[in-house]
């Protein structure tokens, strides 16, 4: 008895396709070993047609694939464009040779069945409507016209010209004639369901002189489109239901037991499981819309359906589209924290993954808002300036080439709590969702800047110090000047970090920044932060105002300031007078600069593919230095 299981018999029709699922026992070896599909010959040999190692035979070229789903312990063989030559005995199996664990599958491909020559076939999708054409001779023009549906024993009336209508067709069936043509009548049936499928007879007149026509109505449920997505990636369901439902409410639901549970609709309903990671976007007035889900989880796999109805809920006899979503746990998207916690007044550094093959793509960070259909306004991007209300406290640091960019938000308030998306204008699968939780601070912040009310005097020297605890001792400290294009890191010289330390005095760890001489361009936000390599940590922000010197000024005594700066310079051997010119504004502000909303984050066609670097905008350079006081006991 083979532990592999699958369908023993598969039967299909020429030109169609099959999806054969083979199930294997749940072991690590099975999950990773070679999977194959082979055809058994008369000699008992089984010739490989396709395998998970990438082998594809000539006769399957362009029409077959094999996909392993280790999380489900299954693999699927999809074969398209079937011909009668595909009829035969096959094996699906596991192992390095075709003599491993296997299961026998018999595939039979038949010719398309022929209907009697006088039968007219109408093929319609569920929820659509059909207009059946019924020709008749002129002598039957005054006679009764009717359409009936064949059952085993009789032909059950659907509608006739005396306005008799079968109860199950009330409001759905119409019998009419067009213009002055007295040789054809029409029956229109709307909101088709599976129960409407079958053989019909339309008739004009009675007895042997009656005109009859056979009709075969086929009502098809849309075949689910198979979607294979990686864990933590995103999926877009593109739903095109047609102009006739353009003004109806739209929905996406997921099959669950006996119902299809609505996940989101255009009337504001949203499943809490998808909070922060779903958008529904009406595309146009032709009934098209899309639903984007980010941060895919294993439990998101399943059978999805989109549709339209005034209630925003699934309704029989209304058009639908379906998908089967598979979520592959062997994901290329790195596993990162989906919840980031911060405290009021503190900061968070969020590492956003992107496809490393697309290091030049534009990076963005947007805040998901659930009102209406959901939307995600961009707050910052590599070529999108920081939103005004985030001035001085939000920056994006791009680290080209390593597959990660960092977004830092400081001066946190409880209002910042919510869902944020990392996205690029490249590979849309790499959209990720972060939930930011902000708790009330219960202790002093780790980084503190003195003086706190910083006003520098034009032409003089000004120093600010950033105090940090011992736990940050081994990390790199930096100062950067914030602008709405990023936070430009100032050159620093960290002497103390290279000295050996026996102990750490909590009160005396600081990194200082000196402006010498202070110019008007120095006014603005500055950040003090810590990082380890390319991994950013905590930050704190300070606004430095620049004023002209006034008599009786209560500002820091210039002599003291110079002396202090001089100490820093002597100790740190830093040339603090280096000054670089302010970087000019980037001419192309990026795709979301004017319209700052990603109303349809799923529409790649509209996304600009220019590249930029928001983390490297140059401000006027100043110096920062670190001082460490070591106490030997």
């Amino acid at each position: 008895k083979s532990p592999i299981f699958g369908p023993q018999e598969v039967s299909s029709i020429e030109g169609d396709s099959v999806s054969i699922t083979c199930y294997y026992p749940d072991t690590s070896v099975n999950r990773h070993t070679r999977k194959y599909w082979c055809r058994q010959g008369a000699s008992g040999m089984c010739t490989t047609l396709i395998s998970s190692n990438g082998y594809l035979s000539k006769e399957y070229s362009g029409r077959a694939n094999l996909i392993n789903f280790p999380e489900n312990n299954t693999f699927v063989i999809n074969i398209e464009q079937l011909t009668q030559d595909d009829t035969g005995s096959y094996k699906c199996g596991l192992g390095t040779s075709n003599r491993g664990l296997s299961f026998d599958v018999s595939l039979e491909v038949s010719q398309v069945p022929e209907l009697p020559s006088d039968t007219h076939v109408y093929t319609k999708d569920i929820g659509r409507n059909v207009t059946i054409e019924c020709p008749f001779k002129r002598e039957n023009a005054p006679s009764k016209k009717s359409l009936c549906k064949k059952t085993n024993q009789s032909c059950e009336l659907v509608i006739d010209s005396t306005e008799k209508v079968n109860p199950s067709y009330i409001g759905r069936a119409k019998l009419f004639m067009k213009g002055t043509d007295l040789t054809v009548f029409y029956v229109n049936i709307s909101h088709l369901t599976h129960n409407d499928a079958g053989l019909y007879i339309c008739q004009a007149g009675e007895g042997p002189s009656a005109d009859k026509k056979n009709v075969d109505l086929q009502v098809l449920a849309p075949e689910p489109e198979l979607l294979y997505k990686d864990l933590r990636s995103s999926v877009t369901f593109e739903c095109d239901l047609g102009r006739e439902v353009a003004n109806e409410a739209k929905y996406l639901c997921r099959m669950n037991k006996e119902t299809c549970d609505v996940i989101i609709n255009t009337l504001g309903k949203r499943d809490p499981d998808f909070e922060g990671r779903i958008l529904i976007t009406p595309k146009d007035d032709n009934g098209r819309f899309s639903v984007l889900i980010t941060g895919l989880r294993k439990e998101d796999a399943g059978h999805y359906q989109c549709g339209a109805h005034s209630s925003g809920l699934p309704q029989e006899g209304w058009p639908i589209q379906t998908w089967q979503l598979f979520v592959n746990e062997e994901s290329t998207i790195p596993n990162r924290r989906s919840v980031v916690k911060g405290v009021t007044g503190g900061s968070v550094a969020i590492a956003c993954p992107y496809n490393p093959k697309e290091s030049s793509s534009l990076k963005y960070w947007c805040r998901w808002e659930g009102d209406g259909n959901g939307h995600c306004p961009v707050l910052v991007g590599t070529q999108a300036q920081v939103q005004e209300e985030y001035e001085g406290r939000l920056a994006l640091f791009d680290q080209p080439g390593n597959g990660t960019y960092t977004v830092i938000l400081n001066q946190l308030t409880t209002e910042d709590a919510g869902f944020y998306w990392c996205l690029t204008n490249g590979d849309s699968r790499w959209r990720t969702t972060i939930e930011l939780q902000v708790a009330e601070a219960t202790r002093e912040p780790n980084l503190e800047v003195t003086p706190q009310n910083a006003t520098a005097v034009l032409g003089e020297t000004f120093t600010v110090s950033c105090h940090y605890p011992c736990k940050f001792y081994s990390q790199e400290k930096y100062w950067c000047k914030w602008s709405n294009k990023g936070c430009h890191i100032l050159p620093s010289h960290d002497e103390g970090a290279r000295q050996s330390s026996v102990s750490c005095d909590q009160s005396s760890q600081l990194v200082s920044m000196t402006l010498n001489p202070v110019s008007k361009e120095d006014e603005g936000w500055y950040w003090c932060g810590v990082k380890q390599g390319q991994t950013y940590g905590e930050t704190t922000a300070i606004y430095i105002a620049v004023e002209e010197r006034t008599r009786g000024s209560s500002h820091v005594n210039p002599t003291d300031a110079n002396a202090r700066a001089k100490v820093a310079l002597e100790e740190e051997v830093v040339d603090s007078s280096i000054s670089e010119k302010e970087n000019k504004a980037i001419p192309n502000p990026g795709p979301f600069a004017n319209e700052r909303e990603i109303q349809n984050v799923g529409d790649q066609a509209q996304e600009n593919r220019a590249s930029g670097d928001a983390g490297s905008a140059d401000g006027q350079s100043r110096s920062s230095s670190s001082k460490h006081h070591h106490h030997h006991h």
Partner: nanobody, 129 residues
Framework: EVQLVESGGGLVQPGGSLRLSCAAS????????MGWFRQAPGEEREFVSA???????????YYTDTVKGRFTISRDNAETTVHLQMNSLKPEDTAVYYC???????????????????WGQGTLVTVSS
Amino acid sequence: EVQLVESGGGLVQPGGSLRLSCAASGRTFSSYTMGWFRQAPGEEREFVSAISWSSDGTYYKYYTDTVKGRFTISRDNAETTVHLQMNSLKPEDTAVYYCAASSSGTYGDPRSEREYRYWGQGTLVTVSS
């Protein structure tokens, strides 16, 4: 809502045949799986056979090892009915046979009870001399 009604059960001698039918009414799907499970007295319910189909007319038939070659599952296209033709019956085939339906098409494991959303009340098959 889908209702499933089984019929065709009864008493048969070893080596004999029976044909079980399962009629589905209410909301029906053009792409779904219908299966047969059985439960012998004091035993757990076990998978017997299943048939999946898609609206393009492709069929997938599944059988458990113990009935392979003796039982045949089929679907009546016009009526939404599935039949299980049981030949060469053995005393160990005695059980209550349940019909089940799933609207998930050809994707879930047809042997797993949790793949099926709708269940019939069951029909008793007794194989005894």
